[in-house]
Amino acid sequence: DITPSVPPASYHPKPWLGAQPATVVTPGVNVTLRCRAPQPAWRFGLFKPGEIAPLLFRDVSSELAEFFLEEVTPAQGGSYRCCYRRPDWGPGVWSQPSDVLELLVTEELPRPSLVALPGPVVGPGANVSLRCAGRLRNMSFVLYREGVAAPLQYRHSAQPWADFTLLGARAPGTYSCYYHTPSAPYVLSQRSEVLVISWEDSGSSDYTRGNLVRLGLAGLVLISLGALVTFDWRSQNRAPAGIRP
């Protein structure tokens, strides 16, 4: 809790906290945190988790307060909450805190992973699904083919991943992906590791079939040798004819 004096939720419901232009921004951007109360308030406070004293105050007789973070640095990223209060509530009494707003200030987002489902080797005519997975929700994911500047496919996703379907005939190739924020200022991830999709071609099938034949023949040779050794061993251990113990 922000203070020991937070009343039950039924008394003073929590406000809403949002960020403009976005919750993920590049360093140097001016960010406005907007705290909106469900009723007119007198004072608003912006809090960092674990701190009892507000980071910033705003004294406004309305339902909305704006907290300006100018030219943000990565150090200003993190969790924020806001509360509001009215003069008739008594000293130190604040509303329920808003839900946590996570502000991320970074030049680039972490590298996504790119994997093929069910695997990177495709049979003729079979489709393959590529999953580009990042760490953040509500991002735009973009799939690229090596040697081509424009995105092959793109997909906005509420999940921290997006799936792309490649048609079997066109699937083989080298792929990579990125994800980025869906609104300005656009923050782009690092590029994923490349993923090579290849044919399960007839050559490799013939090679595998050849190996199976060789293994089979080797097995037969081993069985034959085993039989000969056993036969020889039993011959040597059998008593010669005409000799009695």
């Epitope: 997909r155 906005h156 656009y186």
Partner: antibody, heavy 128, light 108 residues
């Protein structure tokens, strides 16, 4: 003035080939996708595909993949839509439009604006 | 692919009235990637709104867009005679790009 000017109306027979054009002017042709949209008589809009004029790399709607070919010649700021063998069901109005290319750190990302300039449309009639 | 369903199919209103057009997506669409177009008979479509709520250049302020997730709305605050047309929503955040089926706003 920014504009996209499309080639004139065409009347063709089934099985014939056709190539229609869309010429951009008044802006940097390679800074925008060129998008092709079909509108069949009395129907809505359908995205056929888009081309990045920078390297003439085209993207197709699954419904139109293999049915049409989209190409571009950036030296004359022109994009093309072509059919190798027309069908009666290709009778429609075809529009080209532009959509801004967004780049971050030299990477082309998801388009972040709508189609802000449209050609006047090319009517294609296929009938025996 | 994301399917966009527009409602109503036809809206019969008088000049000066308020028009509210709905566009519902089969899956979540970021508001950054939703556009509205107007098309009059015999003309090419015209971009009205992009990013769900940003007016395109030269579009009068009687046109406004709102919404997020799967529900988006185009509002024309006071219909002018030139506003009677067909309106399409479109998402361009996931390939393939898709359009709604359109809403015709006609004079009552």
């Amino acid at each position: 003035e920014v504009q996209l000017v499309q080639s004139g109306a065409e009347v063709k027979k089934p099985g014939e080939s056709l190539k229609i054009s869309c010429k951009g002017s008044g802006y940097s042709f390679t800074s925008y996708w060129i998008v092709w949209v079909r509108q069949m008589p009395g129907k809505g809009l359908e995205w056929m595909g888009s081309i990045y004029p920078g390297d003439s790399d085209a993207r197709y709607s699954p419904s139109f993949q293999g049915q049409v070919t989209i190409s571009a010649d950036k030296s004359i700021s022109t994009a093309y839509l072509q059919w190798s063998s027309l069908k009666a069901s290709d009778t429609a109005m075809y529009y080209c439009a532009r959509q801004k290319i967004t780049m971050v750190r030299g990477v082309i990302i998801t388009p972040l604006d709508g189609m802000d300039v449209w050609g006047q449309g090319t009517t294609v009639t296929v009938s025996s | 692919e994301i399917v966009l369903t527009q409602s109503p199919g036809t809206l019969s209103l008088s000049p000066g009235e308020r028009a509210t057009l709905s566009c519902r997506a089969s899956q979540s669409v970021s508001s950054s990637y939703l556009a509205w177009y107007q098309q009059k008979p015999g003309q090419a479509p015209r971009l009205l709104i992009y990013g769900a709520s940003s007016r395109a250049t030269g579009i009068p302020d009687r046109f406004s867009g709102s919404g997020s997730g799967t529900d988006f709305t185009l509002t024309i605050s006071r219909l002018e005679p030139e506003d009677f047309a067909v309106y399409y929503c479109q998402q361009y955040g996931s390939s393939p790009l898709t359009f709604g089926g359109g809403t015709k706003v006609e004079i009552k």
